[in-house]
């Protein structure tokens, strides 16, 4: 950067280099010339020179005003005009940042993916800083007392076997720059409540020619845990609003929901499971689309696979890709 | 056994700097763990200053009233740790005290000898 | 800013008798309180951690108890070695930019 370069001077700014947006602040330049008694100094913003509210000081100094200054970074330098000089002489260069203190972090949660081997912690940072904000997560045993601590810049995955003080724990997570220190409030947790079961993924979808056509969404999960709740929501393409259904499921065999829908609709179907009693849920799983037949059953598959037309009595509709769910950070 | 040696000059001039250091064997210097000094002025309670937590990164801690005067530094080559408190003035006349337990909790099993540091011209 | 506050500020005692000392946090602090006994001259010893654990070669008269904001020290059988000062401690959390002491005020326990 331009703090780099070899100074004839000595370049410093006022409150300090990095300092609140929106702040007023002063630029002072103090060159050191040999044989240089500078005619004018001059003020560079990113390779720009500044016109206006410039101050001499003394003989060497001089200072550069800015009222209400909102640019996140600049790189400033100033230069002199020396007698006998035909080109102006770089005095001193110095990188400044405005930003502000971080808020207090807030909505702290923490989650094992089954079979992740890691307990992974988010919270809300509150508004953008503009400068480096660095966070500390602290894991605390409620069982022993001991503290680890988990330096990051977002979010943390921690090893669940570094976590051996027990099942219980506090968490907080502490932001921290330049400009300011602050300190979310302490979540506890115990880590047999924060698993959340293996992905729940919609693999095929059947609409059945009977009396009252039916249609039978296949889902699964490779989760190891015994009591799960599923929420199954679904709604035709046009529409806005969710349809939504509830089951308690044994994933030891392929789930079968069936569900009775009109004819010639395309429709979007998303799981999701939680532990059955516990806080948090899966993400929405991909989107799954679905045609049902005019009268005739159809297969369609899932996003951006055409749809396929079927002469026989079922239609099916076969999961093959990976569309990201527009919720996919709905774990609460 | 975790030791904690305190050293450091008894007098030092209104004005000037508090400089203590707190030297420690006996501890898994690859673990976590917090060293933190407390004062005790004469006839009064115990008074927390700061800590130092030292893991796979180190953070430092100090009581609000001390801010802006206090640092505490870690000097790990040495196994040993810092504190330094400026602009002393009598009030600051106390015994020093460094503490640890040689883990990542915050009481405290082992303190150092303590020293008694007067502020006086 | 979590404060602690303990309380009496000092008590007469005769050896044999039961006492007890009550500190309380300004706001929750789970288990996370120490006890230590000091005497004159000397640095504090640790009596009790985690609220209610007894450190290591410390006498079974003592215990602790409590959670959240209130906690007790108690003395079964007050001996003539146990007259000194004690304070309690919260060792919940000091990353907190606001904490001013992390220790109780003292009480002195004296011969009656």
């Known amino acids: 950067g331009i703090t780099n370069i070899n100074c004839s001077g000595h370049i410093w700014v006022e409150p300090a280099t990095i300092f609140k947006m929106g702040m007023n602040i002063s630029i002072y330049c103090q060159a050191a010339i040999k044989n240089c008694q500078p005619r004018k100094l001059h003020f560079y913003k990113n390779g720009i020179k500044e016109r206006f509210q410039i101050t001499r000081i003394n003989k060497t100094t001089a200072r550069l005003w800015y009222k209400n200054f909102l640019e996140p970074h600049a790189s400033m330098y100033c230069t002199a005009e020396c007698p006998k000089h035909f080109q102006e002489t770089l005095i001193c260069g110095k990188d400044i940042s405005s930003g502000y203190p971080p808020d207090i972090p807030d909505e702290v949660t923490c989650v094992i993916y089954e079979y992740s081997g890691n307990m992974t912690c988010t919270w809300n940072a509150g508004k953008l800083t503009y400068i480096d904000t660095k966070y500390v997560v602290h894991v605390k045993s409620l069982e022993t007392e001991e503290e680890q601590q988990y330096l990051t810049s977002s979010y943390i995955n921690i090893s669940t076997d570094s976590l051996q003080g027990g099942k219980k724990y506090l968490v907080w997570v502490q932001a921290a720059n330049a400009l300011g220190m602050e300190e979310s409030k302490q979540l506890q947790i115990h880590l047999d409540d924060i698993v959340i079961p293996s992905a729940a993924v919609i693999s095929r979808a059947e609409t059945i020619n009977a009396t009252v056509p039916k249609t039978i969404i296949y889902w699964d999960s490779q989760t190891t845990i015994e009591k799960v709740s599923c929420e199954m929501r679904y709604k035709a393409t046009t529409n806005q609003t969710w349809n939504v259904k509830e089951f308690d499921t044994n994933f030891t065999y392929v789930q079968q929901s069936e569900f009775y829908l009109e004819p010639n609709i395309k429709y979007v179907f998303q799981v999701r499971c939680q532990e059955t009693g516990k806080r948090y849920w899966q993400p929405w799983s991909s989107l799954f689309f679905h045609k049902t037949p005019e009268t005739v059953p159809q297969v369609t598959s899932k996003a951006f696979q055409h749809d396929t037309w079927n002469s026989g009595l079922t239609v099916a509709s076969i999961s093959t890709g990976h569309l990201t769910s527009d919720n996919r950070g709905d774990i609460g | 056994q975790v030791q904690l040696q305190q050293s450091g000059p008894g007098l030092v001039k209104p004005s000037q700097t508090l400089s203590l250091t707190c030297a420690i064997s006996?501890?898994?210097?690859?673990?976590?763990?917090?060293m933190c000094w407390i004062r005790q002025s004469p006839g009064r309670g115990l008074e927390w200053l700061g800590c130092i937590y030292v893991g796979s990164h180190v953070n430092t801690y100090y009581a609000n009233w001390a801010k802006g005067r206090i640092t505490i530094n870690p000097d790990t080559s040495k196994n040993q740790f810092s504190l330094q408190l400026n602009s002393v003035t009598p009030e600051d006349t106390a015994v020093y005290y460094c503490?640890?337990?040689?883990?990542?909790?915050?009481?405290?099993?082992?303190w150092g000898q303590g020293t008694l540091v007067t502020v006086s011209s | 800013d979590i404060q602690m506050t303990q309380s009496p500020s000092s008590l007469s005692a005769s050896v044999g008798d039961r006492v007890t000392i009550t500190c309380q946090a300004s706001?929750?602090?789970?288990?996370?309180l120490a006890w230590y006994q000091q005497k004159p001259g000397k640095a504090p010893k640790l009596l009790i951690y985690?609220?209610?654990k007894l450190a290591a070669g410390v006498p079974s008269r003592f215990s602790g108890s409590g959670s959240g904001t209130d906690f007790t020290l108690t003395i079964s059988s007050l001996q003539p070695e146990d007259f000194a000062t004690y304070y309690c401690?919260?060792?919940?959390?000091?990353?907190?930019?606001?904490?001013?002491?992390?220790f109780g005020q003292g009480t002195k326990v004296e011969i009656k």
């Open positions: 985690s609220a209610s």
């Open positions: 503490a640890t337990s040689g883990s990542s909790v915050l009481y405290f099993k082992f």
């Open positions: 706001e929750n602090i789970y288990s996370f």
């Open positions: 006996g501890i898994d210097f690859n673990s976590n763990y917090y």
């Open positions: 401690q919260q060792t919940n959390r000091y990353s907190n930019p606001d904490i001013y002491n992390v």
